[in-house]
């Protein structure tokens, strides 16, 4: 969470941004809020990126002005125009690229004053893992798969019954480069699993952490997955 203040004569406004992460190839949002101003035509929103000449996006007089927009953002950005008057200056970003990572500035000018705040935008790839029982294996085993990760994550297994156990000797993890030559598919196999136990496959890099749980009993298989972004907010 970054709060910036701006001074315009006697007036300053508070601008707040949230560090966030973008998933390569998907659409993302760079969050920014400011003190609301009902005079839409008096609001100017400028998004800038450190190291880039030109603007990422500009919104003024109630509409976009992309005349100064940098080529790398062409056709990829939009503000939530109907939410500007309530203080939302967040930026939608289409088809997030690895090169979109960096420091952004959300600059606001309203009839109340000026303000700005920086935002650190991380880019990578992260996806939910899916765990299945691998019936093809010679012994009972579990297969944990996640289709898209970058940078290369670490993978660890855990068990509810054998808490604190090290499963590195009885698991095998591989990383397969996807067709776009950036992200990778993660596959990890855990061998010699026992019935009536809950196992967790944890995949983590500096952007995100994902966990897949599976419980295998004689009568059913229960699964659960979750994904959390790290260092956000």
């Amino acid at each position: 969470l970054i709060i910036g203040f701006g001074i315009s004569g006697k007036h300053f406004i508070t601008v707040t941004t949230f560090t966030s992460a973008g998933n390569i190839g998907e659409d993302g949002t760079l969050s920014c809020t400011f003190e609301p101003d009902i005079k839409l035509n008096g609001i100017v929103i400028q998004w800038l990126k450190e190291g880039i000449k030109g603007l990422v996006h500009e919104f003024k007089e109630g509409k976009d002005d992309l005349s100064q927009q940098h080529e790398m953002f062409r056709g990829r950005t939009a503000v939530f125009a109907d939410q500007v008057v309530v203080g939302n200056a967040s930026l939608r970003l289409k088809n997030v690229q690895l090169t979109d990572a960096g420091t952004y500035t959300c600059y606001i000018h309203t009839s109340k004053g000026k303000g700005n705040a920086n935002l650190e935008y991380k880019t990578g790839a992260f996806s939910m893992p899916e765990i299945n029982v691998d019936y093809n294996a010679s012994s009972e085993s579990l297969r944990c798969e996640a289709p898209r990760w970058f940078p290369q994550p670490t993978v660890a297994w855990a068990s509810q019954v054998d808490q604190g156990a090290n499963f590195s000797e009885v698991s095998n993890t591989s990383f397969e480069l996807n067709s776009e030559n950036v992200t990778m598919k993660v596959v990890s196999v855990l061998y010699n699993v026992t019935i009536n136990n809950t196992y967790s496959c944890m995949i983590e890099n500096d952007i995100a952490k994902a966990t897949g749980d599976i419980k295998v009993t004689d009568s059913e298989v229960k699964r659960r997955s979750q994904l959390e972004l790290l260092n956000s907010g």
Partner: antibody
């Protein structure tokens, strides 16, 4: 409401330059949230995006046509234009102009289209 | 470039019936997809953008769904004016590309 109208020669000789103009009425070409694009459709075939322009003059072209395409804008006339050089029979198509959202980038509305035939 | 593939090429449907048209992208386009209707001698008309948002003035019988690489346009009850060619278009990355079209004809 906003309307677009293509105009230009219906017949162009091989190796010459195809030139079309799109006139925008019912709204300003300087509307900030839009690009202005060209799309073509050979007879009986599908649609191909040619490129777009912003009112400030910045352009983006389809790489398959980039070496032959020029799109320009005249804000004083509320018009934008397409030039396609070194044409062949494969460039025979209905050419449409359209307003293109800055993002989302859908095309709406479209001109009615103009058929350009490349033949000697 | 991203290749858009539509199926079937032709769909024969009786008036009042449901029509389901498919569009597949060669790689993920997230939800950055639009659908258009084109009648003979006319320009295409925008139906759906953002994969599922109906354009202004488009009847509720038209609905879009899907994300990533698989998309569907559904016409819940075909009217006589709906017989036309339908195109999908991705705007996820340049160059923007269209599918080859699906012709919906009267059965």
């Amino acid at each position: 409401q906003l309307q677009l109208q293509e105009s230009g020669p219906g017949l162009v000789k091989p190796s010459e330059t195809l030139s079309l103009t799109c006139t925008v009425s019912g709204g300003s070409i300087k509307s900030g949230s839009y690009y202005w694009g060209w799309i073509r459709q050979p007879p009986g075939k599908g649609l191909e995006w040619i490129g777009n322009i912003y009112y400030s003059g910045s352009t983006y072209y389809n790489p398959s046509l980039r070496s032959r395409v020029t799109i320009s804008v005249d804000t004083s006339k509320n018009q934008f234009s397409l030039k396609l050089s070194s044409v062949t029979a494969a460039d025979t198509a209905v050419y449409y102009c359209a307003r293109e959202g800055s993002y989302p980038n859908q095309f709406d509305p479209w001109g009615q289209g103009t058929l350009v035939t490349v033949s000697s | 470039e991203i290749v858009m593939t539509q199926s079937p090429a032709t769909l024969s449907v009786s008036p009042g019936e449901r029509a389901t048209l498919s569009c597949r992208a060669s790689q993920s386009v997230s939800s950055n997809l639009a659908w258009y209707q084109q009648k003979p001698g006319q320009a295409p008309r925008l139906l759906i953008y953002g994969a599922s948002t109906r354009a202004t003035g488009i009847p509720a019988r038209f609905s879009g769904s899907g994300s990533g690489t698989e998309f569907t346009l559904t016409i819940s009850s075909l009217q006589s004016e709906d017989f036309a060619v339908y195109y999908c278009q991705q705007y996820h990355s340049f160059p923007f590309t269209f599918g080859g079209g699906t012709k919906v004809e009267i059965k």
